[in-house]
């Protein structure tokens, strides 16, 4: 099992954290798959996008997502790290003008069309177990991560005080 630590510690600080620049520090295209190698795909249906978690057929092309990384500063009185308490926030865009959003009321992950500046619901705190294995935590709801539930993306609460198996919130990034 993989543990996500520090979830409770910074709950208030995360709500108060600010994106230090309006421009991302880096951006790149990658395909997104689950820890169990299922692909995250996006389909246009009835003028809105649906998100699926599925096994691709051999040689089927993976959908790409534009990941934009932003630096986020913790208020020094909250983090204890002075000017040094930085996190990486990420936004995920599978197609122009559409971004993944956290719908905390419905515990769902949705694709919304919107203009910049993006709302807080489009920002996720990046955690990683290794360079290419990551988790996405809601900026608007600390302790809640994008995860896989019933072959769909959903918001999943991770209680760090319990020894939970959190493979369902782990995602792999690859350029292929």
């Amino acid at each position: 099992a993989f543990g996500i630590s520090g979830v409770q510690k910074y709950t208030r600080a995360l709500h108060d954290s600010s994106i230090t620049g309006i421009s991302p520090i880096t951006e790149y295209l990658a395909s997104l798959s689950t820890y169990n190698d299922q692909s995250i795909t996006f389909a246009l249906e009835d003028e809105s996008y649906e998100i699926y978690v599925e096994d691709l057929k051999k040689d089927e092309k993976k959908d790409k997502v534009l990941l934009s990384y932003y630096e986020s500063q913790h208020p020094s009185n909250e983090s204890g790290d002075g000017v040094d308490g930085k996190m990486l926030m990420v936004t995920l865009s599978p197609t122009k003008d559409f971004w993944l959003h956290a719908n905390n009321k419905e515990h769902s992950v949705e694709l919304h069309k919107c203009e910049k500046p993006l709302p807080d619901q489009a920002f996720f705190v990046l955690h990683n177990m290794h360079s290419n294995c990551v988790s996405f935590e809601c900026k608007t709801d600390p302790g809640v991560f994008i995860g896989v539930k019933d072959n769909h993306l959903a918001l999943i609460k991770v209680d760090s005080s319990e020894n939970l198996c959190t493979e369902n919130i782990l995602f792999k990034l690859s350029e292929t």
């Epitope: 880096t26 990384y69 983090s79």
Partner: antibody, heavy 121, light 106 residues
């Protein structure tokens, strides 16, 4: 001010063990990945080992796997490198380093001054 | 495993010169690349992260660029205090340093 202080280096015979410690201060230790990087005399830098912020995930350079163990004590703001079955090619200055961002394994933002490990008979 | 190859191994230039150091990865590393400066007898220091972001406190004469497999560190006007060895480092898949480029003053 962020500080990392390594201790535990010294002269050791091949096949013996040594434990390095790195005490951190000036930041919230439990939020950051920590690393050991080494540099043989007159040579380049070589990543040795990594540990994530809660200590649940560890990674090693192939040549030290099964011999070295990285661990951390978040209550004491300390990261360790237990080195067993030491070889002459492990002779190097060992640096402790801290990640750049909370929760991620990207970049070595801060480094200690290093501690020299000499493996020789 | 990803290999990082730096060139040249040694670079001699005059004070005020524009200096370019190269780093090539064996695979696409998605801009997950840093540059570190190490002066003789000192610990390394982070200069540039994520290819082109200047670390706090580093002079603006240092800049980074690149994508895919090819990356560059540029010193726009070489200063005596820039004499050091410079290492590139990738963290896209595992963690790997280049072998270093030693920068000297002519």
């Amino acid at each position: 001010e962020v500080q990392l202080v390594e201790t535990g280096g010294g002269l050791v015979q091949p096949g013996r063990s040594l434990k390095l410690s790195c005490v951190a201060s000036g930041f919230t230790f439990s939020n950051y990945w920590m690393y050991w990087i080494r540099q043989a005399p007159g040579m380049g830098l070589e990543w040795v080992s990594s540990i994530n912020n809660d200590g649940g995930n560890t990674y090693y350079l192939d040549s030290v796997k099964g011999r070295f163990t990285i661990s951390r004590n978040n209550a004491e703001n300390t990261v360790y490198l237990q080195m067993n079955s030491l070889r002459s090619e492990d002779t190097a200055t060992y640096y402790c380093a801290r990640g750049h961002y909370y929760y991620t394994s990207y970049s070595f933002a801060y480094w200690g001054q290093g501690t020299l490990v000499t493996v020789s008979s | 495993d990803i290999q990082m190859t730096q060139s040249p191994s040694v670079l001699s230039a005059s004070v005020g010169d524009r200096v370019t150091l190269s780093c090539k990865a064996s695979h696409n590393i998605n801009k997950h690349l840093d540059w570190y400066q190490q002066k003789v007898g000192e610990a390394p220091k982070l200069l540039i992260y994520f290819t082109n972001n200047l670390q706090t406190g580093i002079p603006s004469r240092f800049s980074g660029s690149g994508s895919g497999t090819d990356y560059t560190l540029t010193i726009s006007s070489l200063q005596p205090e820039d004499v050091a060895t410079y290492f590139c480092f990738q963290y896209n898949s595992g963690w790997t340093f280049g072998q270093g480029t030693k920068v000297e003053i002519k």
